[in-house]
Interface confidence: low
Amino acid sequence: EPPTACREKQYLINSQCCSLCQPGQKLVSDCTEFTETECLPCSESEFLDTWNRETRCHQHKYCDPNLGLRVQQKGTSETDTICTCEEGLHCMSESCESCVPHRSCLPGFGVKQIATGVSDTICEPCPVGFFSNVSSAFEKCRPWTSCETKDLVVQQAGTNKTDVVCGPQDRQR
């Protein structure tokens, strides 16, 4: 009686169980009563990453420099190429099809977490006692200058965007 299910790494065709092709190889012809499944290795720019019955290998992903991408890991006959983003950019999506510039934190905000190849800059508002006067993808909020430690007094209060202005103490004669 012909089989209705096949073992692992086999597939059912014409009431017969044929061996799947191993990763890195594509199917050329199905097995018959008298012959084994015929498989061929994928070419240099192609891959298949599973036991399969595919008649075509998949093209390696192209890391398009115009999309800000570069090769992180070269593909093999069994694995796809892994792309990552150039410096200053991060992936637009999980599949990293293209990259976008890291966000800069505006004055009044500091960098809480510097961007990576896959995540954008995380900004945070500068709390009281701290400021940022630049738009930057790297700079954290900086503490206001301590006038007292310089034997000076505060002449102008600081804000989240500006440092305090220190000046000499008025000396009574």
Epitope: D64, N66, M92, E97, S98, V100, P101, R103
Partner: antibody, heavy 120, light 107 residues
């Protein structure tokens, strides 16, 4: 299929600024980038820059040296192009054109164009 | 910037004939070239992207070829609606740049 509707024609004096809008039929331009291209009378098309609505990331044509600003209002599914310090050579039809992330420069959907005339 | 040069500037062709438009890049742009059709008073329309991929819905009479610095748009049998200006665009490097256009007119 994305439809892009642009704001109406504008007449501006030299030195002024103009802001052109581009409203999409797709919610917040999800999955798309927005390019801006202009065409002066009888001239070739000229790419001005692109914006990624997803996070506001922009890339500009340096020819415009800080005169162009691209922004997005995701909640209104509208992209904006502002051009400042206008001169007579900026008289042109300005187009927005959207592209899928998978091919961000294909510019497969275009607005109808907005004529900006700069004249004293 | 990369300069895209199209030739000829004007091409006079009879309906039913074949039209071959050329676009040359000043440096290697690999296959990062798109072709657009523009009719008077209308926005450009994407025909071909990545040098040879036809956009969905574009008739099979339009085909693109080439890589590196030399690209060709071929219209195998011109229909009356094909008379227009055609632009090539490179998107290998910023700024993206268009050719100056080829006007295809009725002979």
């Amino acid at each position: 299929q994305v439809q892009l509707v642009q704001s109406g024609a504008e007449v501006k004096k030299p030195g002024a600024s103009v802001k052109v809008s581009c409203k999409a039929s797709v919610y917040s331009f999800t999955g798309y980038t927005v390019n801006w291209v202009r065409q002066a009378p009888g001239q070739r098309l000229e790419w001005m820059g692109l914006i990624v609505p997803y996070n506001g990331g922009t890339t500009y044509n340096q020819k415009f040296k800080g005169r162009v600003t691209l922004t997005i209002d995701k909640s209104a599914s509208t992209a904006y192009m502002e051009l400042s310090s206008l001169r007579s050579e900026d008289t042109a039809v300005y187009y927005c054109a959207s592209s899928r992330y998978s091919n961000p420069y294909a510019m497969d959907y275009w607005g109808q164009g907005t004529l900006v005339t700069v004249s004293s | 910037e990369i300069v895209m040069t199209q030739s000829p500037a004007t091409l006079s062709v009879s309906p039913g004939e074949r039209a071959t438009l050329s676009c040359k890049a000043s440096q290697n742009v690999h296959t990062r070239v798109a072709w657009y059709q523009q009719k008077p008073g209308q926005a450009p329309r994407l025909l071909i992207y990545l040098a040879s991929d036809r956009r969905t819905g574009i008739p099979a009479r339009f085909s693109g070829s080439g890589s590196g610095t030399e690209f060709t748009l071929t219209i195998s049998s011109l229909q009356s609606e094909d008379f227009a200006v055609y632009y090539c665009l490179q998107h290998w490097n910023y700024p993206l740049t268009f050719g100056q256009g080829t006007k295809v007119e009725i002979k």
